[in-house]
């Protein structure tokens, strides 16, 4: 064939707005506008059309769009023509999205959820991968089992605890303390037959620079578990925090630059400046992670005038602990995340 598509996820094809093969022209000059502008439904922007002629109600997410019927810029939408190449006449309004991700040599689209293995479910958000464990974390047995250890069982994905007794014969542990993930989720009455659950945020997917963390929550009308994401930046990659540790000290728990700054994402800049706190570093083998944090909403403005907002981790305080793994292993932290309820806030 004359065209060879690469073996990646195919772009969607828009529903036909009309037969564009016979009449591909959408803008007409001179402009022909109705005597009065249309009245738009609640929440739909009244904008100038793409021909820069008339007022129109902006097309919404999933609507067809053309050079004339443009997507709602106030909702961060753009016209995705990828289903109509090479004509680029009719597209579909899509969300302005960030960067795709590469994990273990595999490329994932922004927003795409995937399972790199049986233990984790991951999501690509603006260039960073965030994962949540699929194996329910059962606490190790206590008291009656002096030497618990986790072992892989053939045919099973998730490791299980076994108890090494005095006879050194491993046996499966009794099903005690098998209630939840490592960190306890918020449980409250939501509506009949629904117990609301929000998992803690997963660790940031990168040890420095922009990353993502995710959590599962069923606090919605359908009581259906959904994955939420937020951007995170534990510490800048381009600052050597080791040099800031005072003489005689082994750690710097929190690092805060003197100047305020704007966040940048996919070429877009935050609409206001911030003075964030970052987690520091230690001279020994300890690693510093947030233990008091919250989630803030950051609005971004793009060069073409479009805007969008993202949830972002805001660090208030960090602590340095001994449970450190390879910072480049995005799954390592998920194995042993500390049981601090503040992290989920």
């Amino acid at each position: 064939t004359a065209l060879s598509p690469a073996p990646t996820t195919m772009d969607f094809t828009p529903a036909p707005l009309e037969d564009t093969s016979s009449r591909p022209q959408f803008c007409k000059w001179p402009c022909e506008c109705p005597p009065s502008p249309p009245r738009c439904p609640l929440g739909v922007s009244l904008i100038t059309d793409g021909c820069e002629c008339c007022k129109m109600c902006a097309q919404q997410l999933g609507d067809n769009c053309t050079e004339a019927a443009i997507c709602d810029p106030h909702r961060g939408l753009y016209c995705d023509y990828s289903g109509d190449r090479p004509r680029y006449a009719i597209g579909v309004c899509a969300q302005v999205v960030g960067v795709g991700c590469v994990l273990d040599g595999v490329r994932y689209n922004n927003g795409q959820s995937f399972q790199p293995n049986c233990k984790y479910n991951c999501t690509c958000i603006d260039g960073a991968v965030g994962c949540t464990p699929l194996c329910l974390r059962v606490r190790p047995p206590r008291l009656w089992c002096p030497h618990p250890r986790r072992v892989s069982i053939p045919g099973h994905c998730c490791e299980q605890w076994v108890c090494e007794d005095d006879a050194k014969r491993p046996r499966k542990t009794a099903p005690r303390d098998t209630g939840a993930f490592d960190a306890v989720g918020e449980v409250e009455a939501w509506h009949r037959n629904c117990i609301a659950y929000t998992s803690p945020w997963s660790p940031c997917s990168t040890s420095c620079g922009l990353g993502v963390s995710t959590r599962i929550s069923n606090v919605n009308a359908q009581c259906w578990p959904e994955q939420e994401s937020r951007l995170c930046n534990l510490r800048p990659c381009d600052v050597d925090i080791h040099t800031l540790i005072k003489a005689g000290k082994k750690c710097l728990a929190v690092y805060q630059p003197e100047a305020s700054m704007n966040f940048t994402l996919a070429g877009c800049i935050s609409t206001r400046s911030y003075q964030p706190k970052y987690c520091g570093v230690c001279m020994d083998n300890r690693c510093c992670i947030p233990y008091k944090s919250k989630t803030i909403d950051v609005s971004f403005q793009c060069p073409d005038g479009l805007g969008f907002s993202r949830q972002v981790l805001w660090i208030n305080a960090c602590f340095c602990n001994l449970s450190c793994r390879n910072p480049n292993d995005i799954f390592a932290d998920l194995e042993s995340y500390p049981d601090f309820s503040e992290i989920a806030n």
Epitope: D11, R85, Y88, N109, P303
Partner: antibody, heavy 117, light 107 residues
Framework: EVQLVQSGADVKKPGASVKVSCQAS????????IHWMRQAPGQGLEWMGW????????GYAEKFQGRVAMTSHTSTSTVYMELSRLTSEDTAVYYC??????????WGQGTLVTVSS | DIQMTQSPSSVSASVGDRVTITCRAS??????LAWYQQKPGKAPKLLIY???TLQSGVPSRFSGSGSGTDFTLTISSLQPEDFATYYC?????????FGQGTRLEIK
């Protein structure tokens, strides 16, 4: 103003590879496909392929299949075209252009690639 | 692949003249044709898309017509800055193909 700015001229030896960059400004890179064309000295325009910077999907003209790779780096609003196993016949000005309704607009200023031993 | 054939390959004309360039596709491309102007050492510039729609900022002396397989680009009154090479391009199907070009020279 919507603009595409390409990297500077390059001289390569036969058998080598060349990587040309194309940086977009004035719009969100992920909203449009980028196409690559080339023009040999005194010759017409030849289409090479496209890339969707949002999905990473690509499509190449059969002539270049296996020898061309188009990639994108959305955080820097840059698209790249790499052509390998160069011969003297690959000496040309290489252009990137944004896919628009029924045509290409705008175009980059062009990058002259000279293949000479 | 769709072949695009332009005629003439070159034309000489004077300022103020009306000039017509034709482009023929080897198969039906509906109205999916674009016209470009290219000056020496410069990148092509989109003049007309969808056979007859004038690109924003292009002078109205340029016009396009046709559908199916036969298309024309007309410059109603040549200006000094119009002397250049003109290309047609089909945007109906992949692979995208261009005409070989028409060089417009000063008489």
């Amino acid at each position: 103003e919507v603009q595409l700015v390409q990297s500077g001229a390059d001289v390569k030896k036969p058998g080598a590879s060349v990587k040309v960059s194309c940086q977009a400004s004035g719009y969100t890179l992920t909203s449009y496909d980028i196409h690559w064309m080339r023009q040999a000295p005194g010759q017409g325009l030849e289409w090479m392929g496209w890339i969707n910077p949002n999905s990473g999907n690509t499509g190449y003209a059969e002539k270049f299949q296996g020898r061309v790779a188009m990639t994108s780096h959305t955080s820097t609003s840059t698209v790249y075209m790499e052509l390998s196993r160069l011969t003297s016949e690959d000496t040309a000005v290489y252009y990137c252009a944004r896919g628009a309704m029924g045509g290409f607009d705008p175009w980059g200023q062009g990058t002259l690639v000279t293949v000479s031993s | 692949d769709i072949q695009m054939t332009q005629s003439p390959s070159s034309v000489s004309a004077s300022v103020g003249d009306r000039v017509t360039i034709t482009c023929r596709a080897s198969q039906d491309i509906s109205r999916w044709l674009a016209w470009y102007q290219q000056k020496p050492g410069k990148a092509p510039k989109l003049l007309i898309y969808a056979a007859s729609t004038l690109q924003s900022g292009v002078p109205s002396r340029f016009s396009g017509s046709g559908s199916g397989t036969d298309f024309t680009l007309t410059i109603s009154s040549l200006q000094p800055e119009d002397f250049a090479t003109y290309y047609c391009q089909q945007a109906n199907t992949f692979p995208i193909t261009f005409g070989q070009g028409t060089r417009l020279e000063i008489k």
